[in-house]
């Protein structure tokens, strides 16, 4: 007799899970010299405690307590770029300017980028079938309940000048329902955090507005003001040219307004 | 082979200064992590320092934090350990340790023995 | 600065097999290899194991570790006289940002 399986509205866990975050660990220790003794096997024992036999839609902040405690990885707090519905070119930023950091330069981001997992309660299964999605199944499943936790650690951990990256094209450049606005935002720590700085990226070639002067940036000024943190905006009307000079920034041509 | 090859060690007053060399050869010092760790006379191994490799960070343990400081010079194949503002419980053998991508010391030196006493 | 727990003495007799514990936390042994290291009086320490479980060459596989959790253990089979030593357990701390020695265990064959 087929056993009943909750069927979810989002996609399954990323076929090979297991062996992808560890895969990845292993990967990451390479790269990162600092975490060359990290012991990748009890990363995925602790990463496979936060779900496993667990209701998908009944995840904490505390299952992930235990993985949390590998997340003391010190990456320089002034030196942090968070993102909102931007992602690969913040990514292709900090490739660049490699003394910058989003959240999937650190171990945990990484292993995590771009993956799906869910286990189901009561059993060691992995479910490759279908996921809880965030907004029509529940917002308590194991890979939102993730990242906002690793979200709010970041945040908590900057200082100094935070930068972030911002979609200029979307119809909200600021969205409160984002994981930048409704999780980051508001666990940057006033005492710590001088200044958050907002670089709003253009989508078109003729775009010459100021779309510091969005009412969606203004709301952010206004959260940011409101926490005692001075807010600062810039525009990047060429991307492609901002990339470009941060690679080389003795071009001549990166004088002027990117 | 490897070979690490410690000196600079001797008596010394409290509140003096003392610098540690360790020689190396017979691996491309340049690539590896490398580490001081000592014994105290009737006491366990305690780590002190690390250093990287590349553009070097250091790595402290908190009782020596701000008093030691650990260098390279790639060029010579040697490391050093600065040692200021010793104390009576600094007294050790001090060992010269190469560190292996894992993060274990797979070789060390013979010791060099610091004593601190007026 | 607490390091790791270590019994401070262990003994079998000859051929015997020995087994040494090693306590720690989530922030060292936890998510981090554990070394095991041999240290004869007036001699350099020796790498006797890394990555938890791993023998360089020319470690005899009497010895081998083992991990679970926030412990460790070395296990010396077919106890032989030249095993006589101080055995130290480490591991990188996160909380330290360094390694963490174990108190040491002096290994006596009977």
């Known amino acids: 007799v087929p056993r009943w399986r909750q069927q979810w509205s989002g996609p399954g866990t990323t076929k090979r899970f297991p062996e992808t975050v560890l895969a990845r660990c292993v990967k990451y220790t390479e790269i990162h010299p600092e975490m060359r003794h990290v012991d990748c096997q009890s990363v995925w024992d602790a990463f496979k405690g936060a779900f496993i036999s667990k209701h998908p839609c009944n995840i904490t902040e505390e299952d992930y307590q235990p993985l949390m405690k590998l997340g003391t990885q010190t990456v320089p707090c002034n030196k942090i770029l968070l993102w909102s519905r931007i992602k690969d070119l913040a990514h292709q930023f900090t490739q660049v300017q490699r003394d910058m950091f989003t959240l999937e330069d650190t171990l945990l981001g990484y292993l995590a980028d771009d993956l799906t997992w869910c286990g189901e309660f009561n059993t060691s299964k992995i479910n490759y079938q279908s996921c809880p999605d965030w907004r029509k199944d529940c917002s308590n499943n194991p890979v939102s309940v993730f990242w906002k936790t690793v979200s709010r650690r970041f945040a908590e951990a900057a200082c100094d000048v935070v930068h972030v990256m911002l979609n200029g094209s979307r119809s909200k450049i600021f969205d409160k329902n984002s994981t930048f606005g409704s999780v980051e935002v508001h666990n940057l720590q006033p005492e710590k955090v001088q200044t958050l700085e907002a670089w709003v990226i253009h989508g078109g070639r003729e775009d010459s507005r100021d779309l510091c002067q969005d009412p969606t940036i203004k709301e952010l000024e206004s959260i940011i003001s409101k926490r005692n943190i001075q807010f600062s905006c810039k525009n990047i009307y060429r991307p492609d040219k901002f990339l470009q000079c941060v690679k080389n920034p003795e071009d001549s041509s990166c004088t002027s307004e990117i | 082979q490897v070979q690490l090859v410690e000196s600079g060690g001797g008596l010394v007053k409290p509140g003096g200064s003392l610098r540690l060399s360790c020689a190396a050869s017979g691996f491309t010092f340049s690539d590896d992590y490398m580490s001081w760790i000592r014994q105290a006379p009737g006491k366990g191994l305690e780590w002190v320092a690390s250093?990287?490799?590349?553009?070097?960070?250091?790595y402290y343990a908190d009782s020596v934090r701000g008093r030691f400081t650990i260098s390279r010079d790639n060029a010579k194949n040697s490391l050093y350990l600065q040692m200021n503002s010793l104390r009576a419980e600094d007294t050790a053998v001090y060992y010269c340790?190469?560190?292996?991508?894992?993060?274990?010391?797979?070789?060390w030196g013979q010791g060099t023995l610091v004593t601190v006493s007026s | 600065q607490a390091g790791l727990t270590q019994p401070p003495s262990a003994s079998g007799t000859s051929g015997q097999r020995v087994t040494i514990s090693c306590s720690g936390s989530s922030s060292n042994i936890g998510f981090h290899f554990v070394y095991w290291y041999q240290h004869l009086p007036g001699t350099a320490p020796k790498l006797l194991i890394y990555k938890n479980n791993q023998r360089p060459s020319g470690v005899p596989d009497r010895f081998s570790g083992s991990k679970s959790g926030n412990s460790a253990s070395l296990a010396i089979s077919g106890l032989r006289s030249e095993d006589e030593a101080d055995y130290y357990c480490a591991a990188w701390d996160d909380s330290l940002s360094g390694y963490v020695f174990g108190s040491g265990t002096k290994v006596t064959v009977l």
């Open positions: 250093v990287s490799n590349g553009r070097p960070t250091t």
């Open positions: 340790a190469r560190e292996a991508w894992g993060g274990e010391f797979t070789n």
